[in-house]
């Protein structure tokens, strides 16, 4: 079976890394495990990994925003940032604002790698399933 | 044959959903049909679906922008929004501006699903083939 | 072997097209050659091609930004722009700013095609490996 995941925003995320909806809606999870915010690889190989995060706020103060996909493996002491997007000075002060960050690329992943998504400001994330998501598939 | 599509912007249309160039230029259409703005799936399976829309205007008034990829199937009464990007407060009032929205993710699609792209303001879309496009491929 | 590439930003790029790190870090290069900034196709077929560029500056002056993936082949006199992103009026004058452009789509590529990435303003690109990259894989 094709190894694939598409997880969608979960609004009761309260800490980092982001947590994801892995059961209901347009979710896919096949040949990959989901554990505490992370996608757990169980077969070494090439994967296309992607994520989109939708940031929005009532009154713009241009708080710097970051969106990262990173990897953790017990063999390595430190997280590896695979992809990252940053935004600064992106809206007009005081205005209602909205903006997305999209990341997607190919990586060689190893069995037991855990992939996560991190954002700089959780309170500015909107978790609609069509707007904020995290996925991968094995090539 | 690989099921794949890459359609590019078609500027002489006024209708929603967006209509696409399916014949000339860097277009691809194989194992998938194009009908009235929609990509019609004829084989159930996993697909990576993507779209980019290039918005621009002569004088910024921060009109809210949205870009959606949605699915319609005669079995379901309502459209399903698969992916969406929104922008608000994205440019400096009165200035010439330009911005893109990119969406891409994996979905389990069923034979006879129709996929479309919608935008909130057609007048602000630029339809150059390299800038505005819609595609998919079966994994 | 799967034909795949993921190249990351190389900060000693001094001219166009952008040059890329093809050896160290999270780089992938298999069944595709890298030559003077370009990915060289050696097998005709369908490829998903992607690139992300991270632009940032100390003091916003809203210099128009463009990010292009283009193709060159000795059979054709002119470069073909495959994908492009443009930004205008994207930050508040005088402020420190940061913004990304992401492109990704499917193309039918021919043996000996050379793919490159071009940006409008090299001095505004940040070359961190997680932020600026260029890749493809054969479907």
């Amino acid at each position: 079976l094709r190894k694939v995941a598409h997880l969608t925003g979960k609004s009761n995320s309260r800490s980092m890394p982001l947590e994801w909806e892995d059961t209901y809606g347009i979710v896919l999870l096949s040949g990959v495990k989901y554990k505490k915010g992370g996608l757990v690889i169980n077969e070494t190989g090439l994967y296309f990994v992607y994520s989109k995060v939708y940031f929005r706020g009532q009154s713009c103060n241009n708080l710097p925003l970051s969106h990262k996909v990173y990897m953790r493996n017990s063999k390595y002491p430190q997280d590896l940032v695979m992809m990252e997007g940053k935004m600064m000075s992106y809206c007009t002060t005081g205005q209602m604002w909205a903006r997305s960050s999209y990341l997607g690329a190919v990586f060689n992943l190893t069995s037991a790698d855990h992939l996560y998504v991190n954002v700089s400001e959780l309170s500015l994330v909107n978790f609609e399933e069509s707007q904020t998501f995290f996925g991968l598939y094995k090539l | 044959l690989r099921k794949v599509a890459h359609l590019t912007g078609k500027s002489n249309s006024r209708s929603m959903p967006l209509e696409w160039e399916d014949t000339y230029g860097i277009v691809l259409l194989s194992g998938v049909k194009y009908k009235k703005g929609g990509l019609v799936i004829n084989e159930t399976g996993l697909y990576f679906v993507y779209s980019k829309v290039y918005f621009r205007g002569q004088s910024c008034n921060n009109l809210p922008l949205s870009h959606k990829v949605y699915m319609r199937n005669s079995k379901y009464p309502q459209d399903l929004v698969m992916m969406e990007g929104k922008m608000m407060s994205y440019c400096t009032t009165g200035q010439m501006w330009a911005r893109s929205s990119y969406l891409g993710a994996v979905f389990n699609l069923t034979s006879a699903d129709h996929l479309y792209v919608n935008v909130s303001e057609l007048s602000l879309v630029n339809f150059e083939e390299s800038q505005t496009f819609f595609g998919l491929y079966k994994l | 072997l799967r034909k795949v590439a993921h190249l990351t930003g190389k900060s000693n790029s001094r001219s166009m097209p952008l040059e890329w790190e093809d050896t160290y870090g999270i780089v992938l290069l298999s069944g595709v050659k890298y030559k003077k900034g370009g990915l060289v196709i050696n097998e005709t077929g369908l490829y998903f091609v992607y690139s992300k560029v991270y632009f940032r500056g100390q003091s916003c002056n809203n210099l128009p930004l463009s990010h292009k993936v283009y193709m060159r082949n000795s059979k054709y006199p002119q470069d073909l722009v495959m994908m492009e992103g443009k930004m205008m009026s994207y930050c508040t004058t005088g402020q420190m700013w940061a913004r990304s452009s992401y492109l990704g789509a499917v193309f039918n590529l021919t043996s000996a095609d050379h793919l490159y990435v071009n940006v409008s303003e090299l001095s505004l690109v940040n070359f961190e490996e997680s932020q600026t990259f260029f890749g493809l894989y054969k479907l």
Epitope: - | N12, S13, R14, L63, P64, S120, E121, L122, S123, L124 | -
Partner: antibody, heavy 119, light 111 residues
């Protein structure tokens, strides 16, 4: 900058027709609708119809029962509104306005053309 | 067709005071994304000028003292502190469906 310049005032007899022009400049004529809106003396605004110069498609307010025809000439970036079977109650100022396709708000207006219908 | 009803027909306000204009649609002009209502100002002998679009968004070049709110069928245009140049007729317009229709207008006059 965006400009819409209309033709001059007209005096017409009942039963005749009038054709008002609206020349657009400062933007891509084929990417926006042109709408026509009229205003009778001392009255409110009434939308008559639109044309999309990109493909020539048009829509009309049924209140005008086939009396109105809106056309566009892409080569000169000019829109036209023709109203036939004129009656005294058609005396009004006729405005052309640029309209965004989807949002359908009128963000730029012509200066107006007074059409007087009198025997 | 959707009928737009504005109230009051005339509003007498002193300069510096707040003015609140209402517009009611005969059926909802909102979707899950936007409210398709726009406000215009018209002075004698001039064409209308767009002030607010999509219920609450300020058009480029319009002073921040103008604001719009509402959803569904009830909408409000507020002028926080009236200036002499604000005395005019104000129209709301919907664009939810065809035909586009305008309210009959509210005249804001000097008290």
């Amino acid at each position: 900058q965006v400009q819409l310049v209309q033709s001059g005032a007209e005096v017409k007899k009942p039963g005749s027709s009038v054709k008002v022009s609206c020349k657009a400049s400062g933007y891509t004529f084929t990417r926006f609708d042109i709408s026509w809106v009229r205003q009778a003396p001392g009255q409110g605004l009434e939308w008559m119809g639109w044309i999309f110069p990109g493909d020539g498609s048009s829509q009309y307010n049924e209140n005008f029962k086939g009396r109105v025809t809106i056309t566009a000439d892409k080569s000169t970036s000019t829109a036209y509104m023709e109203l036939s079977s004129l009656r005294s109650e058609d005396t009004a100022v006729y405005f052309c306005a640029r309209s965004l396709i989807s949002t359908a708000m009128f963000d730029h207006w012509g200066q107006g053309t007074l059409v007087t219908v009198s025997s | 067709e959707i009928v737009m009803t504005q109230s009051p027909a005339t509003l007498s306000v002193s300069p510096g005071e707040r003015a609140t204009l209402s517009c009611r649609a005969s059926k909802s002009v909102s979707t899950s994304d936007f409210s398709y209502i726009h406000w215009y100002q018209q002075k004698p002998g001039q064409p209308p000028r767009l002030l607010i679009f999509l219920a609450s968004h300020l058009e480029s070049g319009i002073p921040a003292r103008f604001s719009g709110s509402g959803s569904g069928t009830e909408f409000t245009l507020t002028i926080s502190s009236l200036q002499s140049e604000d005395f005019a007729v104000y129209y709301c317009q919907h664009s939810r469906e065809l035909p586009r229709t305008f309210g009959q207008g509210t005249k804001v006059e000097i008290k």
